[in-house]
Interface confidence: medium
């Protein structure tokens, strides 16, 4: 027998697709020879419209390749994520989202500032928009705190009417008794524990109103509570130590000139809260006329020496030890200016002379039965003592 060895047909010489190369490179490819295609960085293998993890073709007996040549298509990172309270600009070209394209995130001016990075992102070879620091998630637009239309520095007693934008952090809390609070970031409210204690297991019953100047106005931004956090050290009906609470809102609120968070005190804040330094309390509580205020009122009051305040509340009907190190006092020795029933939970704010931003130094807590009484002072929760507690809750929830 003669065995005829038919030399198998060599396969057509493969041509690497644009932006790709083949391996191994041979003079010719015969039966069972194979080659792979690799794409340059920023390009991905596609067969038709389907992405491939890898590609290898085998030369068949009849001189044909077992599969068609793929293409190397430029990586497309797709439309970048929206930035809440910000926007994205295409730098490379309109709607260009392919490899090496550049986009620039920015935050809405005045009321938001960018956290994490400079907002410049590049479409990388792995298909992700990536910042210069290597972050894949978009930046965060954080509300600017402590902005007020006021340039100088119910329990508002002997006060004056607030104007739009004066106290944009002021929050009206309804649902139990009327109380107040102060907006932190764009989804937290700082208030007094005693003001919302009854609602601690029923956050949804709290009706939270922002951006209002009048207590009864229909023009406000409605917010609802998702959760209430009362300080563990607060004991209801046993004094006012640790009279602080946080309310988490179920949605972020839109920041504008009428709704802006208050800043938390920096470590250096105590230098702006010494005896006789002026703080400002605001609220809808009882006024000198004995009515709950219709308009948001405010009063500028000096910080009172802690020992003097402690002594003022050691006489009956108060019990010794009422004023603790977690409290600060403010008011005039002659009386006439104070916070009062209905103002509880509101912020006593101070201007940080270095940053020119307002920060919360105290929370309206308690005081004499007769607001604005001579020789008695308004007592406020000393916020700086609770910064770790506040930050812990906000970062964990």
């Amino acid at each position: 027998h003669h065995h005829h060895h038919h030399a198998s047909q060599p396969c057509p010489y493969p041509m690497a697709p644009p932006n790709g190369h083949l391996s191994p490179v041979q003079a010719k490819y015969i039966l069972k020879d194979s080659f792979s295609i690799f794409c340059e960085p920023g390009y991905e293998l596609l067969q038709g419209h389907l992405p491939l993890k890898s590609f290898a073709a085998v030369c068949q007996k009849d001189g044909s390749w077992d599969q068609p040549m793929p293409s190397c298509s430029i990586v497309d990172c797709g439309p970048p994520d929206d930035l809440p309270s910000g926007r994205v600009e295409y730098i490379t070209g309109p709607e260009v989202t392919t490899y090496k394209a550049v986009i620039q995130y920015s935050c809405e001016e005045t009321f938001y500032t960018m956290k994490v990075n400079d907002g410049k992102y590049v479409c990388e070879a792995d298909g992700f928009w990536t910042s210069s620091k290597g972050e894949r998630s978009p930046p965060v637009c954080e509300p600017v705190c402590g902005l007020s239309a006021r340039t100088t520095g119910g329990r508002i007693y002997g006060g004056q009417k607030a104007k739009p934008g004066d106290f944009p952090w002021q929050v009206l809390i309804l649902g139990g008794s009327t109380a107040a609070g102060a907006l932190l970031y764009d989804n937290w409210v700082l208030t007094a524990a005693h003001a919302i204690y009854e609602q601690k297991h029923d956050a949804s019953s709290l009706d939270i109103r922002l951006g209002a100047l009048k207590r009864l106005s229909p023009h406000y931004t409605q917010a609802w509570a998702e959760a209430v956090f009362i300080h563990e050290g607060y004991t209801h009906d046993a004094g006012f130590d640790n009279d602080i609470a946080l309310i988490k809102l179920n949605n972020k609120v839109v920041i504008n000139s009428n709704i802006t968070p208050i800043c938390l005190p920096r470590k250096e804040a105590e230098s702006f809260m010494r005896t006789d330094d002026i703080g400002t309390a605001s609220g809808w509580g009882l006024t000198q006329r004995g009515l709950l205020a219709r308009n948001l009122m405010y009063v500028d009051i000096p910080i009172v020496d802690h020992q003097k305040c402690t002594a003022a509340y050691e006489k009956p009907p108060y019990s010794g030890g009422s004023v603790t190190a977690n409290m600060l006092c403010a008011g005039l020795e002659s009386g006439g200016k104070d916070s009062c029933r209905g103002d509880a939970g509101g912020a006593l704010v101070f201007l940080d002379n270095e940053t020119q931003r307002w920060f919360v130094g105290g929370i309206v807590s308690w005081g004499s039965m007769n607001c604005g009484e001579a020789g008695q002072y308004g007592v406020y929760t000393k916020v700086i003592n609770y910064i770790p507690w506040i930050k812990n809750i906000i970062s964990n929830f």
């Epitope: 309804l174 649902g175 009327t178 019953s205 009706d207 009048k214 009864l216 106005s217 009515l291 219709r294």
Partner: antibody
Framework: QVQLQQSGPQLLRPGASVKISCKAS????????IHWVKQRPGQGLEWIGM????????GLNQKFRDKATLTVDKSSSTAYMHLNSPTSEDSAVYYC????????????????WGQGTSVTVSS | NIVMTQSPKSMSMSVGERVTLSCKAS??????VSWYQQKPEQSPKLLIY???NRYTGVPDRFTGSGSATDFTLTISSVQAEDLADYHC?????????FGAGTKLELK
């Protein structure tokens, strides 16, 4: 004593607008929001809107946005409601009422009501 | 808008009987509910505010109760002068809304 005195009944042709008045006495007019409420014969009450006499801030039920305009005249302690292009659907008794105060606290309820103004729209 | 549903639509009672009127809100309105009495050809009169607070001069046979979505007006011993329509209303959110009313008649 507290009183809200409303203007008399009105018989109108369709499309002829009307202004109802509500004169307040016996209390500080600028301290209370004034509400307007509609009641069709044999039916319930329907809130139209409210106005703060101190600065004329208004809050309107969206349903009445194109129908009612609320104004006040502080000098005469009078609130007004202007009904635009009335139709038979607007035939009703319209009440003004004040937002109440009790023991120094606003009570989020209407504590005094006018006697009502009957508006009949008929061709 | 919050819908306030009153029941029953009407009821016939004898003098001295205890009457319970119901008002249900379509969503939580806290205690921001008022009750008004309206006699024929008269304007409404405030009876109860804040769900349970009796307004000045209102006889103590009228009692309001409830919170969130379920509210009740109770007349402990109905008198002839109590024959009227009773309206509940919420002032928790705008627009303010009222129920369709309950008509109280004498047997």
């Amino acid at each position: 004593q507290v009183q809200l005195q409303q203007s008399g009944p009105q018989l109108l042709r369709p499309g002829a607008s009307v202004k109802i008045s509500c004169k307040a006495s016996g209390f500080s007019f600028t301290n209370h929001w004034i509400h307007w409420v509609k009641q069709r014969p044999g039916q319930g009450l329907e809130w139209i809107g409210m106005i703060d006499p101190s600065d004329s801030e208004t809050g309107l039920n969206q349903k009445f946005r194109d129908k009612a305009t609320l104004t006040v005249d502080k000098s005469s302690s009078t609130a007004y409601m202007h009904l635009n292009s009335p139709t038979s659907e607007d035939s009703a008794v319209y009440y003004c009422a004040r937002l109440g105060i009790h023991d120094g606290y606003y009570i989020y309820a209407m504590d005094f009501w006018g006697q009502g103004t009957s508006v009949t729209v008929s061709s | 808008n919050i819908v306030m549903t009153q029941s029953p639509k009407s009821m016939s009672m004898s003098v001295g009987e205890r009457v319970t009127l119901s008002c249900k809100a379509s969503e939580n309105v806290g205690t921001y509910v008022s009750w008004y009495q309206q006699k024929p050809e008269q304007s409404p009169k405030l009876l109860i505010y804040g769900a349970s607070n009796r307004y000045t001069g209102v006889p103590d046979r009228f009692t309001g109760s409830g919170s969130a979505t379920d509210f009740t007006l109770t007349i402990s011993s109905v008198q002839a002068e109590d024959l009227a329509d009773y309206h509940c209303g919420q002032s928790y959110s705008y627009p303010l809304t009222f129920g369709a009313g309950t008509k109280l008649e004498l047997k």
